[in-house]
């Protein structure tokens, strides 16, 4: 359905408030260093222009594409070259190359100051003084730090953010009311950003087919009563939504997501019995709720998969006539029967099945060739099961902090070239799999753990891509999306690594560590642990544990001392000497 003016079409569909918010998100995700005020000015200009097009779709420039309009607007920024360097060269290009150029310059780890949370009273005053600016600032700060954040979902976060301030700034104990809510939003926001980053990486690095396969598996687990044709329709629509958002087409993305939510709710009888509550909510909550809805119950008496996919004489005929449809049906049928499997495992099984058919449907005796294909699945299923069992046992034995430390050591030994902040961030997140997933019963552990690990390892991949330092990381990240986790799991100690030179400064600590939050203090200690392993990659667990125990005792002792700084200076030197001796540095 072609519209004379795309910008007018989206303005009318989304409404002014959402239009402005989405344009702000889009601009902040592209120009991540620009000041807030500059973005607000650009957004206001675009909004005023959109209104003229709503009034008269034939008005000058109203027929231009959104990329052209937004790109032209971004290219008016005066300090583009000084602030962004070569990104300014994008402006010399024509659409669609210009937009592709902007996309390529999105920075997953922008050099921006950490967001420091002001005092509650300060925040409440700012909220009351100018609610609109306060909420825009939230969108801006999140969007520029998370350039792939799922824009329509960020609108939902902003709505919750507003609700938290509206409620808590009137409460007797503002802090007790507000801070837990803000912590929850922050943690959920980070998780949401990372999940969306994997979707965009899947689309951009591995293509639409890879994303569609992921979506078939996930939606089939979630909606096992839905017919294959219904799941296929949802997959097609969902792929369009995410392709748009990942491509910076945020207005189209939000609009199409709303249409998809509407369709799902209108057809919930043929999709899932679990959608009723979601579909009673307002739009943003509804879309979020649908995205998080629990798996429906599996239909009773589903027949064996072997009949259609192994025993049938038409297996090769069906495969050859429509490969992706047949493989899609296989994935659908397998996934709806296995909510207990991770999506990535299901995709590995489908890949194995595809490889077998590619081979066997060219063989002299196809049936004999593929007859045992399901037997090949057994080791693929057992590998993540065993890994999760072992790691959950380790987590229960150690607790989260020490489990993270075990992973820090493990991953630093695998890929010691990776920067210390990245190793700390990624290993801490990998370690969170324990508290997130190990509490679940067996049937829910694998989908929770392995699909979460896929999200975390994607963080490593996108951070590493910006400044590649390890061929092993590049190999695991680029060879196969679904085999990333097994690839990293299989890495042993990097024997080619030349240990880092010892630098006493790295292990010098000051009294400021005492005032840090428990989390920040952990990060300091974990940073030291990574550096230690980089200096002594062959150190044993016992050696590292002894040094880390001494280090913890040292911090505790000096933080209790009257003259903390002196304690850190003197005891620190002793600790470094003792550690060097213990590790033979």
């Amino acid at each position: 359905d072609a519209h004379k003016s795309e910008v007018a079409h989206r303005f009318k569909d989304l409404g002014e408030e959402n239009f402005k918010a989405l344009v702000l998100i889009a601009f902040a995700q592209y120009l991540q260093q620009c000041p807030f005020e500059d973005h607000v000015k650009l957004v206001n200009e675009v909004t005023e222009f959109a209104k003229t097009c709503v009034a008269d779709e034939s008005a000058e420039n109203c027929d231009k594409s959104l990329h052209t309009l937004f790109g032209d607007k971004l290219c008016t920024v005066a300090t583009l070259r000084e602030t962004y360097g070569e990104m300014a060269d994008c402006c010399a290009k024509q659409e669609p190359e210009r937009n592709e150029c902007f996309l390529q310059h999105k920075d997953d780890n922008p050099n921006l100051p950490r967001l420091v949370r002001p005092e509650v009273d300060v925040m409440c005053t700012a909220f009351h003084d100018n609610e609109e600016t306060f909420l825009k600032k939230y969108l801006y700060e999140i969007a520029r730090r998370h350039p792939y954040f799922y824009a329509p979902e960020l609108l939902f976060f902003a709505k919750r953010y507003k609700a938290a301030f509206t409620e808590c700034c009137q409460a007797a104990d503002k802090a007790a009311c507000l801070l837990p809510k803000l912590d929850e939003l922050r943690d959920e926001g980070k998780a949401s950003s990372a999940k969306q980053r994997l979707k965009c990486a899947s689309l951009q690095k591995f293509g639409e087919r890879a994303f569609k396969a992921w979506a078939v598996a996930r939606l089939s687990q979630r909606f096992p009563k839905a017919e294959f044709a219904e799941v296929s329709k949802l997959v097609t629509d969902l792929t369009k939504v995410h392709t748009e958002c990942c491509h910076g087409d945020l207005l189209e993305c939000a609009d199409d997501r709303a249409d998809l939510a509407k369709y799902i709710c209108e057809n919930q009888d043929s999709i899932s019995s679990k959608l009723k509550e979601c579909c009673e909510k307002p739009l943003l909550e509804k879309s979020h709720c649908i995205a998080e809805v629990e798996n429906d119950e599996m239909p009773a008496d589903l027949p064996s998969l072997a009949a259609d996919f192994v025993e049938s004489k038409d297996v090769c005929k069906n495969y050859a006539e429509a490969k992706d449809v047949f493989l899609g049906m296989f994935l659908y049928e397998y996934a709806r029967r296995h909510p207990d499997y991770s999506v990535v495992l299901l995709l590995r099984l489908a890949k194995t099945y595809e490889t077998t058919l590619e081979k066997c449907c060219a063989a002299a005796d196809p049936h004999e060739c593929y007859a045992k294909v399901f037997d090949e699945f057994k080791p693929l299923v057992e590998e993540p099961q065993n890994l999760i069992k072992q790691n959950c046992e380790l987590f229960e034995q150690l607790g989260e902090y020490k489990f993270q430390n075990a992973l820090l050591v493990r991953y630093t030994k695998k890929v010691p070239q990776v920067s210390t902040p990245t190793l700390v961030e990624v290993s801490r997140n990998l370690g969170k799999v324990g508290s997130k997933c190990c509490k679940h019963p067996e049937a829910k552990r694998m989908p929770c753990a392995e699909d979460y690990l896929s999200v975390v390892l994607n963080q490593l991949c996108v951070l590493h891509e910006k400044t590649p330092v390890s061929d092993r990381v590049t190999k695991c990240c680029t060879e196969s999306l679904v085999n990333r986790r097994p690839c990293f799991s299989a890495l042993e100690v990097d024997e080619t690594y030349v240990p880092k030179e010892f630098n006493a400064e790295t292990f010098t600590f000051h009294a400021d560590i005492c005032t840090l939050s428990e989390k920040e203090r952990q990060i300091k200690k974990q940073t030291a642990l990574v550096e230690l392993v980089k200096h002594k990659p062959k150190a044993t667990k016992e050696q590292l544990k002894a040094v880390m125990d001494d280090f913890a005792a040292f911090v505790e002792k000096c933080c209790k001392a009257d003259d903390k700084e002196t304690c850190f200076a003197e005891e620190g030197k002793k600790l470094v000497a003792a550690s060097q001796a213990a590790l033979g540095l």
Epitope: K359, A362, A363
Partner: antibody
Framework: QVQLQQSGAELVRPGSSVKISCKAS????????MNWVKQRPGQGLEWIGQ????????YYNGRFKGKATLTADKSPTTAYMQLSSLTSEDSAVYVC???????????WGQGTTLTVSS | QIVLTQSPAIMSASPGEKVTMTCSAS?????MHWYQQKSGTSPKRWIY???KLASGVPVRFSGSGSGTSYSLTIRSMEAEDAATYYC?????????FGAGTKLEIK
């Protein structure tokens, strides 16, 4: 582009063995069956067997079991057929051919002429 | 094993004439493929998966059939079509070829 280059003509004594090669290029050698076909002068085509270089799986025409042995080497992307206990009946042109989905042979080598004579 | 019988063994056709040759299988087969061979050269895949034309094959050729009965048709014979045509079945081990139909130009 896909190419199958076979070794040159062979003249051998009865009772001996011969190994014919087929060097593949221009495609993922491991992922396609390599078939071998026999053609005697003025006669039709006879399928000998096939090998899957990816894992070494083979299928043979029963008539050639014990006569032909198929192997493949992934690093020089070459398939081989060894013929043993040769007799004049084995004199023929032997051709390698790449097998694809649903069993057709889309690319063929130029053929190797084997003459068994005392 | 499945025996493929091609008929006729030899045939000739004038330029512009319609040509049909058949391949009959001793049991039902899944797919039939056809190859063209000219003297002194290796066979070339001509029609595959029963009815698909191989790359570069003129559209005057067509293939059809199912079960035990298959055919190759040339809508309008041309001189360059003179060759031997072999059918080959897939779906039963061992793979087998017909004895060939030799097509000559009148």
């Amino acid at each position: 582009q896909v190419q199958l280059q076979q070794s040159g003509a062979e003249l051998v004594r009865p009772g001996s063995s011969v190994k014919i090669s087929c060097k593949a290029s221009g495609y993922a050698f491991s992922n396609y069956w390599m078939n071998w076909v026999k053609q005697r002068p003025g006669q039709g085509l006879e399928w000998i067997g096939q090998i899957y270089p990816g894992d070494g799986d083979t299928y043979y025409n029963g008539r050639f079991k014990g006569k032909a042995t198929l192997t493949a080497d992934k690093s020089p992307t070459t398939a081989y057929m060894q013929l043993s206990s040769l007799t004049s009946e084995d004199s023929a042109v032997y051709v390698c051919a790449r097998g694809v989905l649903l069993g057709s042979f889309d690319y063929w080598g130029q053929g190797t002429t084997l003459t068994v004579s005392s | 094993q499945i025996v493929l019988t091609q008929s006729p063994a030899i045939m000739s056709a004038s330029p512009g004439e319609k040509v049909t040759m058949t391949c009959s299988a001793s049991s039902s087969v899944s797919y039939m493929h056809w190859y063209q061979q000219k003297s002194g050269t290796s066979p070339k895949r001509w029609i595959y998966d029963t009815s698909k034309l191989a790359s570069g094959v003129p559209v005057r050729f067509s293939g059809s059939g199912s079960g035990t009965s298959y055919s190759l048709t040339i809508r309008s014979m041309e001189a360059e079509d003179a060759a031997t045509y072999y059918c080959q079945q897939w779906g039963s081990n061992p793979l087998t070829f017909g004895a060939g139909t030799k097509l000559e130009i009148k």
